[in-house]
Amino acid sequence: YDFTNCDFEKIKAAYLSTISKDLITYMSGTKSTEFNNTVSCSNRPHCLTEIQSLTFNPTAGCASLAKEMFAMKTKAALAIWCPGYSETQINATQAMKKRRKRKVTTNKCLEQVSQLQGLWRRFNRPLLKQQ
């Protein structure tokens, strides 16, 4: 999906008012310095591409993020504010449903959510120069 035509300000508002705290709660008990940010993004469409990938694509050691509350909210926000997103996701979500896993918080998942927090922070500050 090409995130270029999304309403970025509305997605930012959604993140600030309904998503950010759930990421913090997921990470509760973890030191903020525990994980290094290794995933970055250069602009808002790129950030959303990376956020979608980390949130919804199962990875080795972390197959369960898609059913977390922050993930459901992310999916809902993208469906509302990215034209055509919901249509492109129908096949993907049906495939994901077949491999739905029980929610398990692993260290790999914590690391992945830490990366997500960094991507969202970057998404919210698009005018900052890339480090």
Epitope: T18, T25, S28, M72, K75, A76, Q94
Partner: antibody, heavy 118, light 108 residues
Framework: QVQLVESGGGLVQPGGSLRLSCAAS????????MSWVRQAPGKGLEWVSN????????YYADSVKGRFTISRDNSKNTLYLQMNSLRAEDTAVYYC???????????WGQGTLVTVSS | DIELTQPPSVSVAPGQTARISCGGD??????VYWYQQKPGQAPVLVIY???KRPSGIPERFSGSNSGNTATLTISGTQAEDEADYYC???????????FGGGTKLTVL
Amino acid sequence: QVQLVESGGGLVQPGGSLRLSCAASGFTFSSYYMSWVRQAPGKGLEWVSNISYDSSDTYYADSVKGRFTISRDNSKNTLYLQMNSLRAEDTAVYYCARQQYFDHIDIWGQGTLVTVSS
Amino acid sequence: DIELTQPPSVSVAPGQTARISCGGDSLGGKYVYWYQQKPGQAPVLVIYGDSKRPSGIPERFSGSNSGNTATLTISGTQAEDEADYYCQSYDLGSLNLVFGGGTKLTVL
């Protein structure tokens, strides 16, 4: 303007079935999660069920699991609630509602009354 | 699912400040929403994301959430604010929405 209009309520005997419908207008129905919330006479609000924009995810309150089925037809901008094995305690006003960002409701219908009684 | 506890009733004189509490285990770690419902009408969202007001909701409505308690505050309460108020959050395990039992606000 954004509008949700419920229909299908009425009197039904215990053990019976009923199907509620909700016609949506004024917004892109196929982009939103949708919910049913009920309110027994003189009581508080109780969330019943919700469904994702593409019908891939459905969730139910424990009190209705296995008896109620939520569905939607995006081509008709309509939400449904199939209610089977109805009990007296299912008597309530049933509200169709639009879920914003999955975790809360920003638009409500006016509700339809379901009465389960012999 | 989590349980949200509200006082059944709160009374306030016109022009005074009304506070309605909503208690729940580690509630501060989740977002809380508040709805106003007048007799015979559907609920209306008055606070979202703990403390934000939807457009059209008067500035006298505000919200906060920390620890185990969320609070809806109505400053300079008016007669038209008399209604039932419901807090709502969600269960992080089941992903279900959860409502408090409701509080009847009476403006004396």
